[in-house]
């Protein structure tokens, strides 16, 4: 049904009439995300009309069907000037249970009124700017915390708490105010931490072999995606031994979803969401990934269970083979190991032993090959300069952050990034003095040294001289004209 | 007979084990000398890079040695101001208060009667009024079309602090000032056992026989160039844009016999000031056949590319290109703060529509 | 304020059995490392046993194979089950928490008053 003939049905006022188009606009349109440009002024007024009855209060019995229709029209860009008033977000607010008012909401709400209106919410906050801050200020945070926190007393069906959970990723995302305001007044990472257990349904029995059904998997990912919103900017700060305890068990979850799988396909999507978390966690409290029970089958390393970090090292190499989003897919990750291996030297050996292993191949350069040195080696030199410096800082942390062995393992051509950002251009060590790390010469290494180029990193032979067989006259003329084109440049 | 060995035989084997052994070492230590020359023009970031190593390598410059630098550092800030002063005439820009021009006159009489190493409290108040005026903040957002020191703003805007009496110059004040290089400043520096000997090479013609001695043998170049340089206008005395300039000599001495099988590590420096211009000024001003968008990823490949296709040896030669920002020595506790801001962006991307 | 409090011991006949428990109080149970240390007459402190907050578990040799840790963060109480006990497990033992949430094995933050475990024919 055209949007002008469901208006004009609208004008006329005939109660099941409107339904009954409503009803086959529904239909129609479910799966409309694009709109035709030329009904664009009969959406409009649609819209309007919508809004006019919304705002005024829409019948109990048809309200989901109403509801649904708002949704589909915001989806269009045009009419979310008509949807983003401070009078239809109260009432789109008031329908999905989340609005701060004084008279209470007739209990217990009915569920598909509460999803419709959350889905009308979701939209228009990810759509308009101005629908954000008027959530914003109506503070549907509030709400919305408040009914997560009752998740654990009370059954809402899944679809409810997805969609409460993706209005928070939104508002939290999309406004610094929101974020500050759950992360303190709201209390928002315990909160959510206790929302990620229950959801993760894992206390207190730690079984790393776990699948991830779909839809926990689905609601995980939004509680680590706000997570990650009101973390990032937060706990950079030195943080108290409450706070500390905290953080440390929501380390402890996070290494638990490290090692689980998630149902349907979404096992790499899952992992990445916890690993950014991860990364915004207080670097004291990094030591949870290396702090799993030594079990039957775990994967030991100085008394260490490397099980963990063996993951994230399996979820960088698959991270590598993307070509799409490079800084975001491999910064994080890399930066949890960097700051792993930073703190913990048996996490260090251990990374090491799996990254840089003892040199053998000097006959190709550091960035050529499949390894995952080859791999990292090529990212310095990336055009993105946080792609490289953190993949550079990853090798140069497993190096001990020595200057000499970096070169050994990279080439002094390819370190010259890292080493410049730092100032290490000339050598130097830093103030971070690590317990001195023996590196290993395999035989190879030993017998080709001599000939191996430091500024490439492989052996070449020594090239014949250039200027061989030239007079003292000539060369002095070959090299002032290289002076003459240097006095141009340094002009 | 088994295989046994004569005590005789054993020394022999031992002996000649003992003289390979030599050999490899007096090899290893003509081979693990790296010479690198450093290359770049005027303000390519070159000189910090060698600051940079007495900053962190050397601890650090002393208070005795940065109070040295307070007068090239007021220098420097004087310089800059008036290089905008008179691109305002140059430009045709008014000041936006008449005022202003009393207090040009007198920055021209007072900076002639500057003292080195000092700054009275009138000629600050000068510069501060000056630099605070609209007419003078239009003509410095118009740098391209002159000659100005990228340290201009860092300096002007910190007026307050360095005009202090009791000033001494920070690292990073030491960081940012502009002295012209000449000759040949040459940098020794060991890591374990690689010795390094860089030649930080200005323009001056001294003598030839040290030139020669630098030029032979040299195991890698470094190269740079400022990115920022793309969109500056000719000055009246030069031929070529002086990104182009770079081009050509980057082609001149990146195919050079001498240099046949020197790697080249191309520092593409003041990649921040490029990410800032970028979005102003298109890269066409300097590449005309560029048809990439202007952004920071496709117009830094773009100028990548046009050097590196200059190598005319590609599979003997390699170039190690890096993109810095040559005044971050912060060594900050190494967190992905950059990249947070990106994955919010992607996961909003990734919310559809329901 | 922290406080964590051990449930009666007793005495045991060798090759017996008992259980002890811990109640805790004035801290969120479930963010902390738990441990059970004991202290044999005239002897130091000997680590037994520890459990993540997840409930994954680690033993001392002397009691691996016949001591079992465990909590409920819903009743905020950790256990020890020990089985097979012999004269050498008489001890005070002692429920430990491990400082801000991290990983210990002797240098708890806060600790009970300590029951007494008697195993004696």
């Known amino acids: 049904m055209e949007p002008r003939a469901v208006a004009d049905a609208l004008e006329t006022g005939e109660e099941d009439a409107v339904t009954e188009a409503l009803r086959s606009f529904n239909r129609e349109h479910s799966q409309s995300f694009t709109f035709d440009d030329a009904q664009q002024e009969d959406r409009k007024r649609l819209a309007k009309l919508l809004v006019s009855v919304l705002e005024q209060g829409l019948s109990p019995k048809h309200r989901v069907t109403w509801l649904q229709t708002i949704r589909i029209l915001s989806r269009d860009r045009s009419c979310l000037d008509s949807f983003a008033s401070r009078q239809s977000l109260h009432a789109l607010a008031c329908y999905a249970d989340i609005a701060i008012s004084e008279e209470p909401i007739p209990q217990p709400p009915d569920m598909d009124v509460l999803l419709e209106s959350l889905k009308c919410l979701c939209n228009l906050v990810l759509s308009s700017p101005t629908a954000q801050m008027l959530a914003a200020e109506a503070r549907l945070v509030v709400r919305l915390a408040e009914r997560v926190g009752l998740y654990r007393k009370r059954s809402y069906p899944h679809e409810v708490q997805f969609f409460d959970l993706r209005l928070l990723f939104l508002l939290t995302a999309l406004r610094t105010d929101v974020r500050q305001q759950l992360f303190q007044e709201l209390h928002g990472v315990r909160l959510l931490t206790d929302a990620l257990e229950l959801t993760l349904g894992v206390a207190p029995k730690e079984n790393p072999l776990v699948i991830l059904p779909a839809q926990e998997t689905e609601r995980a990912m939004e509680i680590l995606k706000v997570l990650f919103n009101i973390t990032y900017d937060s706990v950079k700060r030195e943080v108290d031994e409450e706070d500390a305890a905290l953080y440390r068990y929501l380390g402890t979850l996070l290494r638990h979803c490290v090692m689980a799988d998630a149902a349907g396909d979404r096992t790499e999507e899952f992992h990445g969401h916890t690993v950014n978390l991860l990364g915004n966690l207080p670097l004291k409290c990094l030591d949870v990934l290396l702090a799993l029970e030594l079990h039957e089958g775990s994967l030991e390393f100085m008394g260490v269970n490397m099980d963990v970090i063996n993951a994230l090292l399996a979820f960088l190499e698959k991270r590598l083979h993307q070509t799409h989003r490079l800084k975001e897919c491999v910064a994080p990750v890399l930066s949890v190991l960097t700051e792993c291996a930073r703190m913990h030297r048996p996490a260090r050996k251990f990374l090491k032993a799996q990254v840089l292993p003892p040199l053998r191949d000097v006959r190709t350069r550091p960035e050529v090959g499949d390894l995952l040195r080859n791999k990292l080696v090529r990212l310095m030199t990336h055009l993105d300069t946080d792609v490289k410096r953190v993949a550079a800082e990853f090798l140069f942390v497993l190096c001990s952050e020595s200057v000499p062995r970096f070169i050994k393992y990279t080439g002094y051509g390819n370190a010259a990034g890292l080493l410049a950002a730092r100032g290490l251009m000339a050598g130097g060590r830093p103030e971070g003095q690590y317990s001195e790390d023996e590196d290993t010469d395999t035989e190879e290494y030993r017998e080709a040294k001599a000939s191996i180029n430091p500024v490439t990193g492989r052996v070449e032979e020594k090239p014949p001289n250039p200027m061989e067989g030239m007079t003292e006259e000539q060369k002095e003329h070959e090299a002032m004209k290289l002076v003459n084109m240097f006095d141009k440049l340094s002009r | 007979m088994g295989c046994t060995l004569s005590a005789e035989d054993k020394a022999a084997v031992e002996r000649s084990k003992m003289i390979d052994r030599n050999l490899r070492e007096d090899g290893e230590k003509a081979a693990r000398e790296v010479k690198l020359l450093l290359l770049g023009a005027g303000e390519s970031g070159k000189s910090t890079i060698v600051k940079q190593m007495k900053i962190i390598h050397e601890a650090g410059y002393s208070e005795e040695e940065c109070k040295q630098y307070k007068a090239v550092v007021y220098s420097n800030t004087i310089q800059s101001i008036i290089a905008i002063i008179r691109a305002m005439g140059r430009l045709k820009i008014d000041f936006g208060d008449a005022a202003r021009a009393d207090d040009a006159r007198q920055l021209f009489v007072l900076a002639g009667a500057a003292e080195e190493g000092f700054m009275t409290a009138e000629l600050a108040g000068v510069i501060k009024r000056l630099w605070k005026d609209s007419g003078v903040q239009a003509c410095f957002n118009r740098s391209r079309e002159y000659q100005l020191n990228d340290s201009a703003a860092y300096y002007l805007n910190d007026l307050d602090r360095i005009a202090q009496p009791n000033y001494i110059p920070t690292q990073q004040d030491v960081l940012r000032t502009r002295v012209k290089t000449t000759g040949i400043v040459e940098t020794h520096f060991t890591f374990k056992d690689l010795h390094f000997k860089m030649f930080d090479v200005g323009g001056q013609r001294s003598e030839r026989k040290k030139w020669i001695h630098c030029f032979e043998g040299v195991t890698a170049i470094i190269f740079c160039v400022a990115l920022s340089d793309y969109d500056l206008v000719l000055a009246e005395d030069e031929e070529m844009n002086r990104m182009h300039e770079s081009m050509k000599l980057f082609d001149s001495i990146c195919n050079n016999k001498w240099f046949t099988d020197t790697s080249i590590i191309l520092f593409l420096n003041k990649k921040d000031l490029f990410e800032e211009k970028i979005k102003k000024s298109p890269l066409t001003i300097c590449y005309p056949e560029y048809a990439g968008s202007n952004t920071y990823e496709e117009a830094a490949a773009y100028i990548q590319c046009q050097f590196e296709d200059l190598n005319k040896r590609k599979d003997t030669k390699e170039i190690y290109t890096h993109f810095t920002c040559a005044t971050d020595t912060k060594n900050v506790q190494f967190v992905f703060d950059a990249v947070t801001d990106v994955i919010i962006k992607n996961n909003l991307k990734d919310c559809g529509l329901f | 304020q922290v406080q964590l409090v051990e449930s009666e011991g007793g005495l045991v006949q060798p090759g017996g059995s008992l259980r002890l428990s811990c109640a805790a109080s004035?801290?969120?149970?479930?963010?902390?490392?738990m441990n059970w240390v004991r202290q044999a007459p005239g002897k130091g402190l000997e680590w037994v046993s520890r459990?993540?907050?997840?409930?994954?578990?680690s033993y001392g040799d002397s009691v691996k194979g016949r001591f079992t840790i465990s909590r409920d963060n819903a009743k905020n109480t950790l256990y020890l089950q020990m089985n097979s006990l012999v004269p050498e497990d008489t001890a005070v033992y002692y429920c430990?928490?491990?400082?801000?949430?991290?990983?210990?094995?002797?240098?708890?933050?806060?600790r009970g008053q300590g029951t007494q475990v008697t195993v004696s024919s």
């Open positions: 459990i993540n907050q997840l409930g994954g578990t």
């Open positions: 430990a928490r491990c400082p801000a949430g991290a990983a210990c094995k002797v240098e708890y933050d806060y």
């Open positions: 004035g801290f969120t149970f479930k963010y902390y490392y």
